[in-house]
C-alpha cells in the first residue's frame, strides 16, 4: 500500500497558489505525485507523475471555491487522494506592499505600492482585486518600543513635525476593512529627519 502525501497545504501569496506536501516514508523506492483540481464535476490533472512536492495552481479563478487533491504513486500502485478546498480571494495571503520614503526637513514623505498580482500584467495589483483596499502604517522612533498607527486615505502619506535629527522607522501593510483582513508588514524603512529646509534630490 502506498502511503498518501503528508502535510498537504496551500501556500498562496498574492494569488500565487502553490499546493505543497511532504513525501511520506516509503521503503520500496522514490514516489511520484499527481495533483488535480475539480473542474465542473471532473478532476483535471495539473501536475502529473512529478517528483516535486509542490504544484502551481495560480491560474485558478480568484473567485472560485476550488477542490484540489494530490496522491502518491509508485509503479502501478497509488495512495488515496488527499483533498483540500481553497478559495483564493478569501485564503491568499496579502504580501507586503512596497514603500518609498523621503526625508524633507522634519517630515517623512511616504508612497505606497500595492503588491503585484502574481502571473498577471505588471500593472495589476492586489488593490485592483479588493475594492476596499487600504493601508495601515506604523512608525516609531528607532530604539523605542512605542509604535504609532495611522490609516492613510491615499497611496501616500506625510508624517509631519517629527523630532529633528531623529531616526524614525516606518512599515506598511495592506488592509481590507470589509473582510477585517490584514496583510503582511513590509520590512521597516528607517530614515533620519533633519531640521533644515533642503529638498530631497
Amino acid at each position: 500500500m502506498v502511503p498518501p502525501p503528508e502535510n498537504v497545504r496551500m501556500n498562496s501569496v498574492n494569488f500565487k497558489n502553490i499546493l505543497q506536501w511532504e513525501s511520506p516514508a516509503f521503503a520500496k523506492g522514490n514516489l511520484t505525485f499527481t495533483a488535480q483540481y475539480l473542474s465542473y464535476r471532473i478532476f483535471q490533472d495539473k501536475c502529473m507523475n512529478t517528483t516535486l512536492t509542490e504544484c502551481d495552481f495560480s491560474s485558478l479563478s480568484k473567485y472560485g471555491d476550488h477542490t484540489l487533491r494530490v496522491r502518491a504513486e509508485f509503479a502501478d500502485e497509488h495512495s488515496d487522494w488527499v483533498n483540500i478546498t481553497f478559495c483564493p480571494v478569501d485564503d491568499t495571503i496579502i504580501g507586503p506592499p512596497g514603500m518609498q520614503v523621503e526625508v524633507l526637513a522634519d517630515s517623512l514623505h511616504m508612497r505606497f505600492l500595492a503588491p503585484k498580482i502574481e502571473n498577471e500584467y505588471e500593472t495589476w495589483t492586489m488593490k485592483n482585486v479588493y475594492n476596499s483596499w487600504t493601508y495601515n502604517v506604523q512608525y516609531w522612533k528607532n530604539g523605542t518600543d512605542e509604535k504609532f498607527q495611522i490609516t492613510p486615505q491615499y497611496d501616500f502619506e506625510v508624517l509631519r513635525n517629527l523630532e529633528p535629527w531623529t531616526t524614525y522607522c516606518v512599515q506598511v501593510r495592506g488592509f481590507l476593512p470589509d473582510r477585517n483582513k490584514a496583510g503582511e508588514w513590509s520590512e521597516p524603512v528607517c530614515e533620519q529627519t533633519t531640521h533644515d529646509e533642503t529638498v530631497p534630490s
Epitope: L38, Q44, L60, Y63, I117, Y121, W124
Partner: nanobody, 126 residues
Framework: QVQLQESGGGSVQAGGSLRLSCAAS????????MGWFRQAPGKEREGVAA???????SYADSVKGRFTISKDNAKNTLYLQMNSLKPEDTAMYYC????????????????????WGQGTQVTVSS
C-alpha cells in the same frame, strides 16, 4: 455581482453560421478576460475561445479559422462568430468571465473563470 446572459443560439445546417452574444452587467472591476466554453451531452465542458482585457485572443484547435471571439467594451458584450459549423459543434455554449486575469498561459479550463452565464444551445444538423 457580475451577471452574464448568453443569446444567439439555435439550430442550423452544417456549413452555416451563428453569432452568439453575452451581455455582461454588474461589473465592479474595470478589467476582465472572458471566454466561451461548450459542453455536449455526456462530455466535459471545454474551452472554445478566450479574449484578454487588451483584446488578444486564443482558440481551441478544433475551432481555429472558423470561430472568432470579440468584445464591445462600450456595450459590455462578448461575441462568438461561428462559421462553417459542423455537427460536432453541437453543444450548450457558456460565457465566462474572470476579473484581473490574462488569457495567455491559461488552459481555458472552466476552473480558471469565476463568473458564468446560464448557456445557450447550439444544434448543428447534417
Amino acid at each position: 455581482q457580475v451577471q452574464l446572459q448568453e443569446s444567439g443560439g439555435g439550430s442550423v445546417q452544417a456549413g452555416g453560421s451563428l453569432r452568439l452574444s453575452c451581455a455582461a452587467s454588474g461589473y465592479t472591476y474595470s478589467s476582465y478576460c472572458m471566454g466561451w466554453f461548450r459542453q455536449a451531452p455526456g462530455k466535459e465542458r471545454e474551452g472554445v475561445a478566450a479574449i484578454d482585457s487588451d483584446g488578444s485572443t486564443s482558440y481551441a484547435d478544433s475551432v481555429k479559422g472558423r470561430f472568432t471571439i470579440s468584445k464591445d467594451n462600450a456595450k459590455n458584450t462578448l461575441y462568438l462568430q461561428m462559421n462553417s459549423l459542423k455537427p460536432e459543434d453541437t453543444a450548450m455554449y457558456y460565457c465566462a468571465a474572470e476579473p484581473w486575469c490574462t488569457s495567455q498561459g491559461r488552459g481555458r479550463e472552466s476552473a480558471e473563470f469565476g463568473y458564468w452565464g446560464q448557456g445557450t444551445q447550439v444544434t448543428v444538423s447534417s
